[in-house]
């Protein structure tokens, strides 16, 4: 039994103690505020260059955003005591470009991580799963935000960013408990093939302000938890019978098309006749044709198969430069 | 519905105990901190103690240290005050409060967000 | 222990006046801070948590600001509902502790 004393604090410039003692296990490391009654640590916009060694074992909610981190290794979380109580973990904007393997290791009820807006040259396949077994020991990870993670050109490794992220979160089948995963605004020009079928829990999936062209090699089947599909401000340019079916066939599901350009030509027609019938798509009287020319803003809703036409295709003797 | 009920007030004399409960219902109570918060007759809001949901952690007021015990039991989802030697200024109406924090729960502290209606505890010779 | 000091302690106000109530704190709690109302033989009810916070179900009209050691609770247009005690709380650090209360009545 603990009494009531100043075990937290919110006065961020507190030294670290000098004799050689190690720290006490509720206080508050130095540039932090810290409240143990909120079970809450947060280190803001605070140019720190590694996660502090002398967290509070009360924490559940680590707030390092605004940082520079650069690297997050093996274990930097780990201690002992474990942080056994840590639930959510935001390290947003803290410049990360590199996040090694069994970063997030020991920390037992990690249900949230977010690291958005965070420059990843480097994930590492075993960032979230701790181990390169073929099936690793289940990740406690609920939800995971991986907003704005796209390294700029200059900083990409050789392999493309889809798939490395893609091995991330297959790896040792570590997250078939997640339940949220966002990918929003990572350039992405297409989703890997066979990622989601790892991923069965998920019930809200943020693919929105990406460049996606095609969803042709993407199975929706056994996300049959979904309740929120994001795909908001693609490249989008027809979904095909396929993934018509597939959507259609999940339970819960809504799915957001918005600002993508939509390609009104023949293919569109079984687009267009099932979005007139389905109640999967949130807002569909919004989404607008982009092309051809002449079908520019014309709402999908209104069309029928007398507009959906596509130009002959030329015989090559016949076609001009 | 989530439901937190006090029993166990009374009046008693100075020096005396008393054991306040609260049955909870409505919500899982072992993955719950949980607090009593106290209040004087025409006076304000005064916090007494405090226990997490395993029971690992508390934390008392001053003014009770020494004399109240905050205690669970998780299988019959009930939360105790275990009061001794009794003052007069410890006659309040006593509420049980769940906080918000859960074991499974991630984000932020919305504080003490459920109460019981209260039991009256009158310290008197 | 942090003491919190809250005021007025009580005020007058009619339906639809915009009411502030003040809280400052002995010494900094970042933005570690709740409000509650509670009305006559009731249960206190949490209205703003992290100082600025909207509680589910709380209705619009009641904001709060502040961080470091002064805080604030505005409502906006006071509705026939809304007269009752209202109290600041930290939980920068245990104990926690309330403000005394700001009793908001009918004018």
């Known amino acids: 039994t603990s009494s009531a004393s100043s075990s937290s604090s919110s006065a961020p410039f507190l030294a670290s103690a000098a004799s050689a003692q190690p720290p006490l296990p509720d206080q508050c490391p130095a540039l932090c505020e810290c409240s143990e009654a909120a079970r809450t640590v947060k280190c803001v916009n605070r140019n720190l260059t590694e996660v502090p060694t002398d967290l509070p074992l009360y924490v559940r909610n680590l707030f390092l955003t605004g940082n520079q981190l650069a690297v997050l290794p093996a274990g930097a979380f780990a201690r002992r005591p474990p942080l056994a109580e840590l639930a959510a973990l935001n390290l947003s904007g803290s410049r990360l470009d590199e996040v090694r393997g069994g970063a997030f290791e020991h920390l037992p009820s990690l249900r949230q991580l977010d690291l958005s807006h965070n420059p990843l040259a480097y994930l590492s396949p075993f960032a979230f799963s701790g181990s390169n077994a073929s099936i690793s020991a289940p990740s406690p990870l609920v939800e995971l935000i991986l907003n704005h993670i796209v390294p700029p050109d200059d900083k990409r490794q050789n392999r493309s960013f889809e798939g490395m992220v893609a091995a991330a979160l297959v790896a040792g089948r570590a997250l078939q408990g997640l339940h949220l995963l966002e990918l929003a605004s990572n350039h992405f020009l297409y989703l890997p093939r066979d990622v989601l079928a790892q991923l069965p829990s998920l019930r809200y999936l943020d693919l929105s302000n990406n460049s996606l062209v095609s969803l042709t090699y993407v199975s929706f089947r056994n996300l049959t938890h979904l309740e929120s599909l994001h795909l908001e401000d693609n490249a989008l340019k027809v979904l095909h019978n396929g993934t018509l079916a597939e959507l259609q066939g999940l339970p819960h599901v809504r799915v957001f098309l918005d600002n993508n350009p939509w390609v009104c030509d023949c293919h569109m027609a079984d687009m267009v006749t099932w979005l007139k019938q389905t109640g999967v798509v949130q807002g569909k009287d919004r989404l607008t044709c982009a092309f051809p020319e002449k079908m520019r803003n014309r709402v999908l809703l209104e069309l029928n198969s007398a507009d959906l036409d596509c130009d002959p295709i030329l015989p090559p003797s016949l076609q001009t430069s | 519905q989530v439901q937190l009920v006090e029993s166990g007030g009374g009046v008693v004399q100075p020096g005396r105990s008393l054991r306040l409960s609260c049955a909870v219902s409505g919500f899982t109570f072992s993955s719950y901190d949980m607090n009593w918060v106290r209040q004087a007759p025409g006076k304000g809001l005064e916090w007494v103690t405090f226990?997490?949901?395993?029971?690992?952690?508390?934390y008392n007021a001053d003014s009770v240290k020494g004399r109240f015990t905050i205690s669970r039991d998780n299988s019959k989802n009930t939360l105790y005050l275990q009061m001794n030697s009794l003052r007069a200024e410890d006659t309040a109406v006593y509420y049980c409060a769940r906080d918000s924090y859960s074991r499974s729960w991630y984000g932020d502290y919305y504080g003490m967000d459920v109460w019981g209606q209260g039991t009256t505890v009158t310290v008197s010779s | 222990d942090i003491q919190m000091t809250q005021s007025p302690s009580s005020l007058s106000a009619s339906v639809g006046d915009r009411v502030t109530i003040t809280c400052r704190a002995s010494?900094?709690?970042?933005?570690?801070l709740a409000w509650y109302q509670q009305k006559p033989e009731k249960a206190p009810k949490s209205l703003i948590y992290?100082?600025?916070s909207l509680q589910s179900g709380v209705p619009s009209r009641f904001s709060g600001s502040g961080s470091g050691t002064d805080f604030t609770l505005t409502i906006s247009s006071l509705q026939p509902e809304d007269f009752a005690t209202y109290y600041c709380?930290?939980?920068?650090?245990?104990?926690?502790?309330f403000g005394g209360g700001t009793k908001v009545e009918i004018k």
């Open positions: 226990i997490s949901y395993d029971g690992s952690n508390k």
């Open positions: 709380q930290q939980y920068n650090s245990y104990p926690l502790t």
């Open positions: 992290a100082a600025s």
């Open positions: 010494q900094g709690i970042s933005s570690w």
